[in-house]
C-alpha cells in the first residue's frame, strides 16, 4: 500500500482466483481512543469500532472511502483505491490502446517546435467518475523540472455504438535550450483513477522526436503569365522556432485532383515557393517537416487551383 | 590541448554542401546499422545515450545563433561563446567567436574520426563479417574537415591489444552512430544559420 | 458485462430455511457490490442484504436482520442468500444483481447487471 495523495491510498492486489489478497490496517487520524466507529462509502452501517480496522482487500468492493465518527463526528477519511496485477502484468482498461506507432501506446505526444512546450493526449470509452493527474520530468533518476496543467477533455468522437473521449494535457519544460542536444529523454507519468481503480501509464521521449510544425501559413498563388503554371508562395507557421535560418524547414508541395485517384504530383522543395502547373478543379497543398530531423510531416495547407 | 588554428574561410556554401553530406551519410549508416543489428539494443528507445565529445568541445555553446542567447537556459552551463553576425562573414574573413564554433565542430569530427576508424578495425576482425562502416561516411567526415581548414594535431588511431568483444562493439557503434547523428544536425542547422547570416 | 444465475428457490413452510444461490460470469472483478433483492406481485422491489466487495460490509433491512445472512465464495464467484425463519411475507420472486457503483448500495436503481430471478414461496 503506498499514498497517492493526502488520504488517498493505493493498494497493490495480485489478481488470480483464491488470492489472499492484502491486509490493510487503517487508523483513525485522531488524540481519541474510546468511542470510534468505521463506516465505508456514506453508509451508516458500522464496520467495526476502535482506533484501527483491519480490512482483508480482495476485490474492488473491499476499497473505498473509510470514514472513523466520533459521536456523529468525522474525525478522519482513508480512500483505498486498487492497482491490479494479473500475470504480472498491471492493468490497463481505463485508457484505449492507440497502435500509433506501435502497440500497446497509451499516451501520445507532440510538439509544434523545439521550446520544451509539448502536449500529449490519451482516449477512453468512459464518460463518468474518471480523474487524471499528470507529471513530468527530464530524465528519472536525477529528474528536472517539467510543469504540466490539468488534463482536460478535448475531443468527444463517436465509434460505432461506443463513444470514445479524448483528454489531453500541455507541459512545459522549465528550462529548455532549444539548440540543445537532448541526451535524457522526457517521461510523462499518468495517474488514472475510474471509481476506484487506479492505474498509470507512461511515456518517454526527446522532444526531437516528437516534432511535428504547424501547417505552412500563407499559402498563395501566382499566375505565371502565357503559362498553365502558378507560382506557390508560402511562410513558416508562426509557431515554429526561431531563428528559421538554424531551424530549417523543408516542403513538399502536392497538386492533387478533384478525385483521389488522379496521379499526385508532388515536389520537394526547402524553399518557401515552388512552380507548378495547375489543373482544373486541382487544389494545391503544402507541408513542412523540420529539414534536418525527419520526425513528422505537419498537416497539410491547402488552395484551390481556381 | 591545443585550440586548432584558424585560417581564412574560403565561404561557406562548400562547408554547408559537405554538411549536408555528412547527416545524410550518418542516417544512412544509422538506418543499415539498425537493419543489420536488428537484434541489438540499437533504436534510440533502447541505448544510453553518449556524447564522447562532452566536456572536451562545446559545439552546442559555442554555435549558438545570436538570437538564441537571450535565452538564460541556453547559457546556464558554461561560458558561452556565440556567433557574431556583422560584417566578418561579407568580407570572408573569419570572426573570433565563429572561429570557436567552426573549430569545435571540426574537433567533434576528428574526436569521431578516430573512435569510427579504431571502431572499423575491431569490426573488420570480426568472423560474423555483420557490418561495417560506410567508407562514403569516413570520406565525408575527412571532407567536411577538410572544407573546415583548420589546421589541427593529428590524434593517433587507438590500438588495442586485447580480443575484441564485437557484441560491446556493435552495441557501442550503435551508440556512436545515435550520437554522431544529433550532432550532425547541430553541425547542419549551424551551416546553414551561418550561410544565411 | 456481468452474467448473474440464480438457483435454490422453491416452496418451503413458515420457519423453513432456504439457501439461495448466485453464480457470477464475466467482467464480475468489475463489481463493487452485489446483492439480494425481491419483489412480490403489486409491490415495488426491495432490498434484501448486499455483500460489499469480497465481505467488508454486509447490509440488511430490519425486516430480515438477524434471519438472513449473505455471503460469499470469491473463488467460485458466488453469492448465497441463507434464509431461516422464513414468513409468508417473505414470498416474492429473488433477484441477485451486481452493481459497479460505490455509493446507495442498498438501492435498487443503482444496480446494472440482474439475474432472472427464481421464486420462493412461504406457505403450509
Known amino acids: 500500500i503506498w499514498e497517492l495523495k493526502k488520504d488517498v491510498y493505493v493498494v497493490e492486489l495480485d489478481w488470480y482466483p483464491d488470492a489472499p489478497g492484502e491486509m490493510v490496517v487503517l487508523t483513525c487520524d485522531t488524540p481519541e481512543e474510546d468511542g470510534i466507529t468505521w463506516t465505508l462509502d456514506q453508509s451508516s452501517e458500522v464496520l467495526g469500532s476502535g482506533k484501527t480496522l483491519t480490512i482483508q482487500v480482495k476485490e474492488f468492493g473491499d476499497a473505498g472511502q473509510y470514514t472513523c465518527h466520533k459521536g456523529g463526528e468525522v474525525l478522519s477519511h482513508s480512500l483505498l483505491l486498487l492497482h491490479k496485477k494479473e500475470d504480472g502484468i498491471w492493468s490497463t482498461d481505463i485508457l484505449k490502446d492507440q497502435k500509433e506507432p506501435k502497440n500497446k501506446t497509451f499516451l501520445r505526444c507532440e510538439a509544434k517546435n523545439y521550446s520544451g512546450r509539448f502536449t500529449c493526449w490519451w482516449l477512453t470509452t468512459i464518460s463518468t467518475d474518471l480523474t487524471f493527474s499528470v507529471k513530468s520530468s527530464r530524465g528519472s533518476s536525477d529528474p528536472q523540472g517539467v510543469t504540466c496543467g490539468a488534463a482536460t477533455l478535448s475531443a468527444e468522437r463517436v465509434r460505432g455504438d461506443n463513444k470514445e473521449y479524448e483528454y489531453s494535457v500541455e507541459c512545459q519544460e522549465d528550462s529548455a535550450c532549444p539548440a540543445a542536444e537532448e541526451s535524457l529523454p522526457i517521461e510523462v507519468m499518468v495517474d488514472a483513477v475510474h471509481k476506484l481503480k487506479y492505474e498509470n501509464y507512461t511515456s518517454s521521449f526527446f522532444i526531437r522526436d516528437i516534432i511535428k510544425p504547424d501547417p505552412p501559413k500563407n499559402l498563395q498563388l501566382k499566375p505565371l503569365k502565357n503559362s498553365r503554371q502558378v507560382e506557390v508562395s508560402w511562410e513558416y507557421p508562426d509557431t515554429w522556432s526561431t531563428p528559421h535560418s538554424y531551424f530549417s524547414l523543408t516542403f513538399c508541395v502536392q497538386v492533387q485532383g478533384k478525385s483521389k485517384r488522379e496521379k499526385k504530383d508532388r515536389v520537394f522543395t526547402d524553399k518557401t515557393s515552388a512552380t507548378v502547373i495547375c489543373r482544373k478543379n486541382a487544389s494545391i497543398s503544402v507541408r513542412a517537416q523540420d529539414r534536418y530531423y525527419s520526425s513528422s510531416w505537419s498537416e497539410w495547407a491547402s488552395v484551390p487551383c481556381s | 590541448r591545443n585550440l586548432p588554428v584558424a585560417t581564412p574561410d574560403p565561404g561557406m556554401f562548400p562547408c554547408l554542401h559537405h554538411s549536408q553530406n555528412l547527416l545524410r551519410a550518418v542516417s544512412n549508416m544509422l538506418q543499415k546499422a539498425r537493419q543489420t543489428l536488428e537484434f541489438y539494443p540499437c533504436t534510440s528507445e533502447e541505448i544510453d545515450h553518449e556524447d564522447i565529445t562532452k566536456d572536451k568541445t562545446s559545439t552546442v555553446e559555442a554555435c549558438l545563433p545570436l538570437e538564441l542567447t537571450k535565452n538564460e537556459s541556453c547559457l546556464n552551463s558554461r561560458e558561452t561563446s556565440f556567433i557574431t553576425n556583422g560584417s566578418c562573414l561579407a568580407s570572408r574573413k573569419t570572426s573570433f567567436m565563429m572561429a570557436l564554433c567552426l573549430s569545435s565542430i571540426y574537433e567533434d569530427l576528428k574526436m569521431y574520426q578516430v573512435e569510427f576508424k579504431t571502431m572499423n578495425a575491431k569490426l573488420l576482425m570480426d568472423p560474423k563479417r555483420q557490418i561495417f562502416l560506410d567508407q562514403n561516411m569516413l570520406a565525408v567526415i575527412d571532407e567536411l574537415m577538410q572544407a573546415l581548414n583548420f589546421n589541427s594535431e593529428t590524434v593517433p588511431q587507438k590500438s588495442s591489444l586485447e580480443e575484441p568483444d564485437f557484441y560491446k562493439t556493435k552495441i557501442k557503434l550503435c551508440i556512436l552512430l545515435h550520437a554522431f547523428r544529433i550532432r550532425a544536425v547541430t553541425i547542419d542547422r549551424v551551416m546553414s544559420y551561418l550561410n544565411a547570416s | 458485462e456481468v452474467q448473474l444465475v440464480e438457483s435454490g428457490g422453491g416452496l418451503v413452510q413458515p420457519g423453513g430455511s432456504l439457501r439461495l444461490s448466485c453464480a457470477a460470469s464475466?467482467?464480475?472483478?468489475?463489481?463493487?457490490?452485489m446483492g439480494w433483492f425481491r419483489q412480490a406481485p403489486g409491490k415495488e422491489r426491495e432490498f434484501v442484504a448486499v455483500?460489499?466487495?469480497?465481505?467488508?460490509?454486509?447490509y440488511y433491512p430490519d425486516s430480515v436482520k438477524g434471519r438472513f445472512t449473505i455471503s460469499k465464495d470469491s473463488s467460485k464467484n458466488t453469492v448465497y442468500l441463507q434464509m431461516n425463519s422464513l414468513r409468508a411475507e417473505d414470498t416474492a420472486v429473488y433477484y441477485c444483481?451486481?452493481?459497479?457503483?460505490?455509493?446507495?448500495?442498498?438501492?435498487?436503481?443503482?444496480?446494472?447487471?440482474w439475474g432472472q430471478g427464481t421464486q420462493v414461496t412461504v406457505s403450509s
Open positions: 444483481a451486481a452493481t459497479t457503483n460505490r455509493f446507495k448500495n442498498t438501492d435498487y436503481t443503482t444496480y446494472d447487471y
Open positions: 455483500i460489499r466487495g469480497s465481505g467488508v460490509a454486509t
Open positions: 464475466g467482467r464480475t472483478f468489475e463489481t463493487i457490490a
